[in-house]
Amino acid sequence: QNCSGPCRCPDEPAPRCPAGVSLVLDGCGCCRVCAKQLGELCTERDPCDPHKGLFCDFGSPANRKIGVCTAKDGAPCIFGGTVYRSGESFQSSCKYQCTCLDGAVGCMPLCSMDVRLPSPDCPFPRRVKLPGKCCEEWVCDEPKDQTVVGPALAAYRLEDTFGPDPTMIRANCLVQTTEWSACSKTCGMGISTRVTNDNASCRLEKQSRLCMVRPCEADLEENIKKGKKCIRTPKISKPIKFELSGCTSMKTYRAKFCGVCTDGRCCTPHRTTTLPVEFKCPDGEVMKKNMMFIKTCACHYNCPGDNDIFESLYYRKMYGDMA
């Protein structure tokens, strides 16, 4: 992907970009591409949206192949129609304490984030808002009729919290780490981010990890057993290699992925861990990236909804990491 060669673009004409996404030249000044947005993977050839003040953050200098689109230092955040300064903390609602950092918002739940799986005495657990209470509570009732076309895919789900205690104090530093955000893709390779000050200087920093809830090419519905409506964690028949912008993982992984349901439920990561994965690129360069690995998935009716800006963006996130 070096820029010294002659420019040649894909045979198709310039792409049509979604509303609000800029059509820009790639990093070599060669081809017109849709600019990558905040939190998306970027490369020299796939640049971030310059009109939104984004740049491609490659992390360590050794990994100058693939980065994450990041807002420039000190960029404010627009959240729910309000502008917050970088470094400013705010309570978005009674449920969340949030922090703005360089254009990205990280939030920590103030309500219990437990997961209730179906059980014989409560086959259809559901969170409901009770009058006069901020935090939702679990209730058990019969499900409403679900009208669903095809399987419900989701990358979002409340996960058990296994991260550091958010109130932990270390050497005059109140260590705070927001939960990992939902994977940016419901299938294929995506990005998950969080904000933390769990470092030597106690400074807020953004962390990111690769994530894959399920492969896009897998036809998971076919594996649902007769009489069942879900496949929670489908068996992956053979170890796979991960691909990232033309680079391939050096090791093969017998990774777990989340399945699908045909009754409107979403299957999403329940317990995860973060491990480094080494990718080898065609030019021989090796880069190391942190990646989410799924330990367990859960299928539930608590699927993302777009009726509440905050709920849809931040409520159904992947909570924590287990060691």
Epitope: S4, G5, P6, C7, D11, L25, C30, R32
Partner: antibody, heavy 119, light 112 residues
Framework: EVQLVESGGGLVQPGGSLRLSCAAS????????MAWVRQAPGKGLEWVAN????????DLLESLKSRFTISRDNAKNSVYLQMNSLRAEDTAVYYC????????????WGAGTTVTVSS | DIVMTQTPLSLSVSLGDQASISCKSS???????????LEWYLQKPGQSPQLLIY???SRASGVPDRFSGSGSGTDFTLKISRVEAEDLGVYYC?????????FGQGTKLEIK
């Protein structure tokens, strides 16, 4: 009809300068790269330079980089070749060509303009 | 620089016969995107060049199917299955995969 028309050629003394122009019509100019190719009398074709859609990237023959500059004005549907410190070996017919930037390179050519460098 | 060497430099063919021109590159002309940008141009007497073939074997718009291109790596060939009077002129191969972009020295096709 897709058309490229070159102008600005002529007789110039060694060390002199010329600015060639190429006026495009019949297509969306800003959707194409443009290029200059030259042909010395009785000789073959030689690529000189090309320029991307908006002029932010230019590539030139290494031996000409210090003397030649390619530029474009999308508002005027024109591409230019500024030639300085001209030498006798720069004598040639200079063709303006459309570069698709995709599958093929030069799919449309102008008729050419003659540059003669002589004292 | 990549040198494009054409053979023969001159070719005399009877109308209706097949003509074949070879072009060899001094090194591989595979672009970093995996495509091979090998093209053929025809310059008729007193005219500007015109594109015949691009990406080794794709015919440009309006080019008769008697023209065909083939090859890979460093060896490429242009074939004219049934030569017509309008085909006379100088044929140039061209590589656009590496800088500097280079043309072959040309092959002059004459009609017997």
């Amino acid at each position: 009809e897709v058309q490229l028309v070159e102008s600005g050629g002529g007789l110039v003394q060694p060390g002199g300068s010329l600015r060639l122009s190429c006026a495009a019509s019949g297509f969306t100019f800003s959707d194409y790269y443009m290029a200059w190719v030259r042909q010395a009398p009785g000789k073959g074709l030689e690529w000189v330079a090309n320029i991307n859609y908006e002029g932010s990237r230019t590539d030139l023959l290494e031996s000409l980089k210090s003397r030649f500059t390619i530029s474009r004005d999308n508002a005027k549907n024109s591409v230019y070749l500024q030639m300085n410190s001209l030498r006798a070996e720069d004598t040639a017919v200079y063709y303006c060509a459309r570069d698709t930037s995709r599958g093929s390179y030069f799919d449309v050519w102008g008729a050419g303009t003659t540059v003669t460098v002589s004292s | 620089d990549i040198v494009m060497t054409q053979t023969p430099l001159s070719l005399s063919v009877s109308l209706g016969d097949q003509a074949s021109i070879s072009c060899k590159s001094s090194q591989s002309i595979v672009h970093y995107n995996g495509n091979t940008y090998l093209e053929w141009y025809l310059q008729k007497p007193g005219q500007s060049p015109q594109l015949l073939i691009y990406k080794v074997s794709s015919r440009a718009s309006g080019v008769p199917d008697r023209f065909s291109g083939s090859g890979s790596g460093t060896d490429f060939t242009l074939k004219i299955s049934r030569v017509e009077a309008e085909d006379l002129g100088v044929y140039y191969c061209f590589q656009g995969s590496h800088f500097p972009l280079t043309f072959g020295q040309g092959t002059k096709l004459e009609i017997k």
